[in-house]
């Protein structure tokens, strides 16, 4: 078995880091491989083990518990196949952050012909990401997802107001949201579960 290139790792920066790696042939990840990891810079750090699973026949993924990381944490990692080391390297959870996807996306009717979208960011106030996340809201026609609007929410509050009449009346729309860190390097989260609603408003007389 050979590892192709470097494993790709990211962290949710609260409890879990995930590594994925590609192999040169089909493998049963959980029976043939294991990933050892430990906090660096301290000789007495506990050695931890992650048993990978297949995400494809030649791709393994491991979810490692890294509870409440801090910026300067770094883990030494070693991938083993029985008694042979396939790869070793290090990973900093703060160096590649993929935040938890937001949840509880909700549409509220607002005053003055506006919709209000709200959602929950899943980080507690003592986490670096609590005040840091920016959001992207995608609103698309349910019957034609290629017709969409994107709102970049660069303020901290998990909410977005937009005019009802920016969307067509008499059409079903779907919204979803994702987040990323401004101050830590990384990628967008997965999209939140989407919500769908029927957009209806009375056209002005002149447009009827």
């Amino acid at each position: 078995i050979k590892v192709l290139g470097e494993p790709t790792c990211f962290s949710d920066y609260i409890r879990t880091s995930t590594c994925e790696w590609f192999l040169d042939s089909a493998v049963d990840c959980s029976s043939q491989l294991c990933l050892h990891y430990r906090l660096m810079f301290f000789e007495f750090s506990e050695n931890l083990t992650c048993i990978p699973r297949n995400s494809a026949s030649t791709v393994c993924v491991c979810h490692m518990e890294m509870n409440r990381p801090v910026q300067s944490d770094r883990y030494q990692m070693e991938l083993w196949a029985e008694h042979r080391q396939l790869w070793q390297g290090s990973f900093s959870p703060s160096g590649n952050v993929k935040p938890l996807a937001p949840d509880n996306l909700t549409l509220h009717t607002n005053v003055s012909d506006e919709w209000l979208l709200t959602w929950n960011n899943l980080y507690p106030s003592n986490n670096l990401l609590y005040k840091d996340l920016i959001s992207m809201v995608n609103i698309s026609r349910e019957d034609n997802p290629a017709e969409f609007i994107v709102y970049n929410v660069t303020y901290k509050e998990p909410r977005l107001s937009f005019p009802i009449n920016i969307l067509m009346s008499g059409v079903y729309y779907t919204a979803r949201v994702r987040v990323r860190s401004q101050i830590l390097t990384g990628t967008w989260s997965e999209w939140s579960p989407s919500i769908t609603w029927y957009n209806h408003f009375q056209l002005p007389l002149i447009q009827r």
Partner: antibody
């Protein structure tokens, strides 16, 4: 013996920038984080940020983001901190320190920065 | 940010007696089976010096007169017996949460 030798005192004008150095010896420079800490006169200590010399990964205290920039030169085992747009609030002693498991086991000699017109 | 409250702000202890310094964190600093609380000594004109790491581990070269204890939010540095060379300011430091923070210091005077 593990040592961190810092550059000498700096007297700078308000609005200017300053760059100080921290030269490591007695250990493998790329194996440990280097942290920077501020101590204002007669005050406690404030963490500024860290850098991992092996690949340049770094992180900052939100308070010092935009104020401090951390870099390293692996070939000379030296870490650098640049402070910009200096004001009298930046007058302090600045320490580099080697990071272990979320603590600082060896401290530099300190660089005194005085901001005055 | 986690706030560390040290007490007392200063104390005077007779040579050969015991000195006890307290550090209280605004929230728990325990994680991974460790307490991420550490203690430093600083003398005038010198950098801080690590004494105790991970709440109770004595740094190499530090006299056994120094000891640390505690978990979660309440920690103690004890010097017993105190020597003349121990006159200094002592700081606690946590790093269970970004950013790492320090206590305001306790100044120890030897009588």
């Amino acid at each position: 013996e593990v040592q961190l030798q810092q550059s000498g005192p700096e007297l700078v004008k308000p609005g200017a920038s300053v760059r100080m150095s921290c030269k490591a010896s007695g250990y493998t420079f790329t194996d440990y984080n280097i942290h920077w800490v501020k101590q204002s006169h007669g005050k406690s200590l404030e963490w500024i940020g860290y850098i991992y010399p092996n690949n340049g990964d770094n992180g900052y205290n939100q308070k010092f983001r935009g104020k401090a920039t951390l870099t390293v030169d692996k070939s000379s085992s030296t870490a650098y901190m640049e402070l910009r747009s200096l004001t009298s609030d930046d007058s302090a002693v600045y320490y580099c320190a080697r990071g272990r498991l979320r603590y600082f086991d060896v401290w530099g000699t300190g660089t005194t920065v005085t901001v005055s017109s | 940010n986690i706030v560390l409250t040290q007490s007392p702000a200063s104390l005077a202890v007779s040579l050969g007696q015991r000195a006890t310094i307290s550090c209280r964190a605004s929230e728990s600093v325990d994680n991974y089976g460790h307490s991420f609380m550490h203690w430093y000594q600083q003398k005038p004109g010198q950098p801080p010096k690590l004494l105790i790491y991970l709440a109770s581990n004595l740094e190499s070269g530090v006299p056994a007169r120094f000891s640390g204890s505690g978990s979660r939010t309440d920690f103690t540095l004890t010097l017993d017996p105190v020597e003349a060379d121990d006159a200094a300011t002592y700081y606690c430091q946590q790093y269970n949460e970004d950013p790492p923070t320090f206590g305001s210091g306790t100044k120890l005077e030897i009588k």
